[in-house]
């Protein structure tokens, strides 16, 4: 097999500190076009399990603004436009990576963090527990 | 407005390099327990707009495994368990941050990248275009 040599342009890291800290370039390569979920689609309004988008802002985190979905109803919207409580609106969650300033207020020192965010809602058949 | 003073314990960074590259601590703080969406909920099966989860794998990215939702039907499942084509199953998308090695083969130098992933599906009323 071929051993890929370490790139000579790599930042140096001593074994005693490695791999606690790495260098991350913040010039983000973005393969997408639009980051605002309200602009990118109106599914949140047209869904049978509609949701509101709440702005979650934290200046000590990157990205500082994350949009969180909150389902509008416990039930789902039926064909008549009414809430049907025989069905449930539930949030779809996704685990995402964020950077948190550490120590706080340091402009160029961060810690990786995983957080769970609600992206939107879907309509599901409820799990019914029958009592004997 | 109040200017938060810079923490005196911050690593040093010259303005000419900031904020291109930052230092990131890899002791990841994980506020969640399980990263596997199949285990965390069965909404993908119980939804009126059910979806399948496909593994998107790239060993040169972190996270290397990302689950992508693909809606099973064009329409939505009605109360009889049949597909109703008067409604549409659509993917809910989320922009997430991932890390990629840069320069390649450097063990501790990375670049942030944004990718768009489909997290699940929701059932929406279609937009009907009437032709005059």
């Amino acid at each position: 097999g071929i051993t890929i040599p370490r790139n000579p342009g790599c930042p140096n890291s001593e074994d005693k500190n490695f791999p606690r800290t790495v260098m991350v370039n913040l010039n983000i390569h973005n393969r997408n076009t639009n980051t605002n979920p309200k602009r990118s689609s109106d599914y949140y309004n047209r869904s049978t399990s509609p949701w509101n988008l709440h702005r979650n802002e934290d200046p000590e985190r990157y990205p500082s603004v994350i949009w969180e979905a909150k389902c509008r109803h416990l039930g789902c919207i039926n064909a008549d436009g009414n809430v049907d409580y025989h069905m449930n609106s539930v949030p779809i969650q996704q685990e995402i990576l964020v950077l948190r300033r550490e120590p706080p207020h340091c402009p160029n020192s961060f810690r990786l963090e995983k957080i769970l965010v609600s992206v939107g809602c879907t309509c599901v058949t409820p799990i019914v527990h029958h009592v004997a | 407005g109040i200017t938060i003073p810079r923490n005196p314990g911050c690593p040093n960074s010259e303005d000419k390099n900031f904020p291109r590259t930052v230092m990131v601590n890899l002791n990841i703080h994980n506020r969640n327990t399980n990263t596997n969406p199949k285990r965390s909920s069965d909404y993908y099966n119980r939804s009126t707009s059910p979806w399948n989860l496909h593994r998107n794998e790239d060993p040169e990215r972190y996270p290397s495994v990302i689950w992508e939702a693909k809606c099973r039907h064009l329409g939505c499942i009605n109360a009889d368990g049949n597909v109703d084509y008067h409604m549409n199953s659509v993917p809910i998308q989320q922009e997430i941050l991932v890390l990629r090695r840069e320069p390649p083969h450097c063990p501790n130098s990375f670049r942030l990248e944004k990718i768009l992933v489909s997290v699940g599906c929701t059932c929406v009323t279609p937009i009907v275009h009437h032709v005059a």
């Epitope: 097999g1 051993t3 790495v22 | 794998e57 060993p59 972190y62 290397s64 495994v65 063990p107 990375f110």
Partner: nanobody, 119 residues
Framework: QVQLQESGGDWVQPGGSLRLSCGAS????????MYWVRQAPGKGLEWVAK????????YYVDSVKGRFTISRDNAKNSLYLQMNSLRAEDTAVYYC????????????WGQGTLVTVSS
């Protein structure tokens, strides 16, 4: 889903040998560095050994060099750890873990297998 399952842990006397195995599924095993990690009673996690995708590079923590050998069989999606000349301080739960590009960082590891070394 990504799954890792260790086996082979047992009680053994000092100086004895054991062979740990790990079966992997839910990812392309041959595309990742793989690790053995251990946690001694009351201690933190410590990486023990790691092996490159094709098995051509292997690294060990100083305390096990010359005694432990890591290997893999990509055709069987399996990882192994041959442990010789075992010492009391090797007593721990041993986990296999899937490597990531983040150095020594793991998102997935198994349930673990207990190795007890005592007389």
């Amino acid at each position: 889903q990504v799954q890792l399952q260790e086996s082979g842990g047992d009680w053994v006397q000092p100086g004895g040998s054991l062979r740990l195995s790990c079966g992997a599924s839910g990812f392309t095993f041959s595309s990742y560095w793989m690790y053995w990690v251990r946690q001694a009673p009351g201690k933190g996690l410590e990486w023990v050994a790691k092996i490159k995708q094709d098995g051509t590079e292997k690294y060990y923590v100083d305390s096990v060099k010359g005694r432990f050998t890591i290997s893999r069989d990509n055709a069987k999606n399996s990882l192994y750890l041959q442990m010789n000349s075992l010492r009391a301080e090797d007593t721990a739960v041993y986990y296999c873990a899937k490597g990531e590009i983040l150095p020594h960082y793991f998102d997935y590891w198994g349930q673990g297998t207990l190795v007890t070394v005592s007389s």
